[in-house]
Interface confidence: low
């Protein structure tokens, strides 16, 4: 691996090596490797045996690794509303008398305008607006599969509140498989949460637009209030573009084994498009706070040095025990935008723009 | 702010908002800002000003930043498991007859041996081994809070399977809630997931050590396999020189604009311990996959060069727009481990100790 | 949410009046803010409107060229500055909060306005 | 002359329906700019009553209500009551003159 300067890979392994000596020592906060003298002879006894492999055995139920950024999801993501159809459809008239569930219909056809292809779309978020509410209720959400047949999508514990509230529920799967049925009215369903042995099985919690006793003021619900699917999505002619060019690589075990490559705080940096950019066409947000890391991360062991007195320093200067440890953003935001193509005025989500915070990595 | 050279921090914020330029640019795939000829004066129609918004709007169930790792985190965990009170303790008696659930019991004291104070404790795992199932089943877990009162914990779509599985629930704040509760016997319950129509409510998942129809096999059911806490926690003796030891602050903005701090494959490097680190302590692993990051992450932007060339460049070398894009770990995996204290083994949890992919960043 | 409205008066023809509306109860560096009159027993009247960083302002053709509206967003301070003043000037004018970022799309808040009585 | 005309003066009885209208053009109301509703008491600043065509504001009665159709739009009371004698406003953004624009205002007079 050759960059301007020729890396001497024996000599960043050695460094690496003699950063995991530290990193280990300084975790466990031991100032040398603990005396073995009293160690008992034999194998490990079972129990610990067993403890140890219940660490280390990946179960069902936690997270798996995150995934790499896919190249699709680097580009920004056109944003558009589907509102669901409306209530006074008969659509909804079976439904009516049902206590425990509120029901959403959605028509294929609005979401294949915003997404004509299932591929393409990144998110999709059902959001619904709850109205203020003095109970706490716990609720599910389920995607209509036939007639009879409801499957589970999600739940949420609804705790009191004085306000209306935004809830949001991810649906892109759902959404996606609505696109590969071809087009037809796909329904939805927010539940009370009923336990084996509840009494009360009524949903407490109404819902700007479609909750019952509110039915008679649907004339007056401002449509943007009704429940609604937020989309996300490659629009058709950048995803052309996607398929036609080189893809880039997840920068993963597979592909960096056999490859070459190379090359600690958040600075204030607010970008003004105006100003520092010099641009006009992005109508929303005037600008935004981008920030930027900057700072040295110093190499902080070597054989050379006292043990004790850099394990300290570890945890702030080189807590992955990096070779070269390098100042990077940690949290990073999206940032939404809203510009014109001709007169069309488009709202597109940019990812990863906003730098919250930095590390030593 | 100086480094072993004077870093020009003007120029430094200029090559950023030349980056964000080619990133924005980049991620909507334009070669260069669209023109604004057509577009109508004004304000922007309210339904898109909508659609920015909710996008841009932060909504109840969309997740949070991720928190940047709090000190303690950066430290090894002991590892103990504390398995469920026996079976043939009459505090099950009561449960005996319900179909739709199975309950276990532990005891707080024993969790407090492993745990003294509950700040100390990292993560606790409710383990259950299920057996092997043809049918499909929607189950759910609680927590019990008063005799007759259960708090929903979560839920899990079991699918058949073909061998024993271990489901994992994270129940790190009940146990610290049972920690904060003074001694005594603590319950969970694990259910049938129950529609408010479902007429079929009954459990057909069978939990190792604790479904009804093996109870007759209980003298056979390996302790081992019995539902069980996993608990990581600070050891008491570790806490204390945390709490002494001068706090490591967060990177975020609050610290960072008033203080000082600067430095793309994966390679694959194999510690062996007793190879590379001359050490015979650690009794497993005998080493681990460590790896690490190296390769240049070019800047590859700036006024004098041809917009449409770069932009395809962005997305592998500077997907964050950095002034000085960088090669760091992007996925880390903890490492578990055991060593003797004395006579006394130990395991113990190191995180962010494998590097499995990295980025420019 | 309250706003109040200051600086109105008597002025002679040709004179100059600055108007300011201090804010409180929002966030008055994200909203829109617009001015409306009133001429004694007529109707509403849209004056101006400003952007949340003020980069941007509306005037209607009546007044153009001659008010500048702009806003102090750490002071939580909204102003009008009218130049060139006309008999036909006359009027309660009021400070409102705009339903949107521009201020031109509706106004959900009032000041209880203040008296502009342009005479010789 | 408003860009948006309204009849300048109605009456109805206590317990009425009245409609009072707001008639626009292209560039503003049928353009699909949002319709805001306003109400002034006697002697008081105007208040807020229908944002976006027909949602309500805060603390206003459902008895108010709007709607809009082509470039016609319409606020609607129900139950007609004394309190609510006043001045009723519509104001919409006009593309063509890139301003908001008022009504010329109705007076609602409850007999």
């Known amino acids: 691996l050759s960059t301007c300067k020729t890396i001497d890979m024996e000599l960043v392994k050695r460094k690496r090596i003699e950063a995991i000596r530290g990193q280990i020592l300084s975790k466990l906060r031991l100032a040398s490797p603990p005396s073995q003298g009293e160690v008992p002879p034999g194998p490990l006894p079972e129990a610990v045996l067993a403890l140890y492999n219940s660490t280390r055995d990946r179960v069902a139920g936690e997270s798996a690794d995150p995934e790499p950024e896919p190249e699709a999801d680097y580009y920004a993501k056109e944003v558009t509303r589907v509102l669901m159809v409306d209530r006074n459809n008969a659509i909804y008239e079976k439904t009516k008398d049902i206590s425990h569930s509120i029901y959403m219909f959605f028509n294929t056809s609005d979401i294949r305008e915003a997404v004509p292809e299932p591929p393409l779309l990144s998110r999709a978020e059902l959001r619904l607006q709850r109205l203020k509410s003095s109970v706490e209720q716990h609720v599910e959400l389920y995607q209509k599969y036939s007639n009879n047949s409801w499957r589970y999508l999600g739940n949420r514990l609804l705790t009191p509140t004085d306000t209306p509230e935004w809830l949001s529920f991810d649906v892109t799967g759902v959404v996606r498989q609505w696109l590969n049925q071809g087009d037809g009215i796909q329904g939805a369903r927010f539940s009370a949460h009923c336990s084996c042995d509840s009494k009360d099985n009524k949903l407490h919690v109404e819902i700007n637009g479609i909750s019952p006793k509110r039915r008679g003021d649907l004339g007056t619900i401002h449509d943007m209030n009704r429940p609604f699917l937020l989309l996300m999505a490659t629009p058709l002619e950048r995803a052309q573009h996607l398929h036609s060019s080189r893809h880039r690589r997840a920068l993963d075990t597979n592909y960096c084994f056999s490859s070459t490559e190379k090359n600690c705080c958040v600075r204030q940096l607010y970008i003004d498009f105006r100003k520092d950019l010099g641009w006009k066409w992005i109508h929303e947000p005037k600008g935004y706070h981008a920030n930027f890391c900057l700072g040295p991360c110093p190499y902080i062991w070597s054989l050379d040095t006292q043990y004790s007195k850099v394990l300290a320093l570890y945890n702030q200067h080189n807590p992955g025990a990096s070779a070269s440890p390098c100042c990077v953003p940690q949290a990073l935001e999206p940032l939404p935008i809203v510009y014109y193509v001709g007169r069309k005025p488009k709202v597109e989500q940019l990812s990863n723009m906003i730098v919250r915070s930095c590390k030593c990595s | 702010l100086s480094t072993c050279k004077t870093i020009d921090m003007e120029l430094v914020k200029r090559k950023r908002i030349e980056a964000i330029r080619g990133q924005i640019l980049s991620k909507l795939r334009l070669a260069s800002p669209p023109s604004q000829g057509e577009v109508p004066p004004g304000p922007l129609p309210e339904a898109v000003l909508a659609l920015y918004n909710s996008t841009r709007d932060r909504v109840a169930g969309e997740s949070a930043d991720p928190e940047p790792e709090p000190e303690a985190d950066y430290y090894a965990k002991e590892v103990t498991r504390v398995l469920m009170v026996d079976r043939n303790n009459a505090i099950y008696e009561k449960t005996k007859d319900i179909s739709h659930s199975i309950y276990m019991f532990f005891n707080t004291s024993d969790i407090r041996e492993a745990v003294p104070e509950p700040p100390l404790l990292s993560r606790a795992e409710l383990r259950l081994q299920r057996l092997k199932s043809s049918v499909e089943q929607h189950v759910e877990l609680y927590q019990k809070y008063s005799n007759n009162s259960w708090r929903y914990l979560g839920n899990r779509l079991l699918t058949p399977t073909d061998t024993p599985e271990w489901l994992s629930f994270d129940v790190t704040g009940v146990v610290r809630q049972w920690l904060n509760q003074g001694d005594g016997i603590q319950g969970a319950r694990f259910s049938a997931h129950c529609s408010c129509d479902s007429k079929d409510n009954k459990l057909h998942v069978e939990i190792n050590g604790i479904s009804p129809k093996r109870r007759g096999d209980l003298g056979t059911i390996h302790d081992m396999n019995r539902p069980f806490l996993l608990l990581m926690a600070t050891p008491l003796e570790r806490a204390q020189h945390l709490h002494s030891s001068r706090h490591r602050r967060a990177l975020d903005t609050n610290y960072c604009f008033s203080s000082t701090e600067k430095n793309c494959c994966v390679r694959q490097l194999y510690i062996d311990f007793r190879k590379d680190l001359g050490w015979k302590w650690i009794h497993e692993p005998k080493g681990y996959h460590a790896n690490f990051c190296l390769g240049p992450c070019p800047y590859i932007w700036s006024l004098d060069t041809q917009y449409s060339k770069v932009l395809a460049l962005y997305n592998q070398h500077n997907p964050g727009a950095s002034a000085s894009p960088c090669c760091v770990p992007q996925a880390l995996e903890p490492l578990p481990i055991v060593y003797y204290v004395g006579r006394k083994p130990k395991v113990e949890q190191l995180s962010n100790m494998i590097v499995r992919s990295c980025k420019c960043s | 949410l309250q706003l109040v409205e200051s600086g109105g008066g008597l002025v002679q023809p040709g004179g100059s009046l600055r108007l300011s509306c201090a804010a409180s109860g929002f966030t008055f560096s994200r909203s829109g803010m617009a001015w409306v009159r009133q001429a004694p027993g007529k109707g509403l009247e849209w004056v101006s409107a400003i952007t949340p960083g003020g980069t941007a302002t509306y005037y209607a053709n009546s007044v153009k060229g001659r008010v500048t509206m702009s806003r102090d967003n750490a002071k939580n301070t909204l102003y009008l500055q009218m130049n060139s003043l006309k008999s036909e000037d006359t009027a309660v004018y009021y400070c409102?909060?705009?339903?949107?970022?521009?201020?031109?799309?509706?106004?959900?808040?009032w000041g209880k306005g203040t008296l502009v009585t342009v005479s010789s | 002359q408003s860009v948006l005309t309204q009849l300048s003066s109605m009456s109805g009885s206590p317990g009425q329906t009245v409609t009072i209208t707001c008639t626009g053009s292209?560039?503003?109301?049928?353009?699909?700019?949002?319709l805001s509703w306003y109400q002034q008491l006697p002697g008081t600043a105007p208040k807020l009553l229908i944002y976006n065509t027909n949602n309500r504001a805060s603390g206003v009665p459902n008895r108010f209500s709007g709607s809009k159709t082509g470039s016609l739009a319409s606020l609607t009371i129900t139950g007609l009551q004394a309190e609510d004698e006043a001045d009723y406003y519509c104001g919409c953004y006009d593309d063509s003159l890139n301003t908001y624009v008022f009504g010329g205002g109705t007076k609602l007079t409850v007999l």
């Open positions: 292209s560039s503003n109301i049928g353009g699909g700019y949002y």
């Open positions: 409102a909060k705009g339903l949107v970022s521009s201020g031109l799309n509706g106004m959900d808040y």
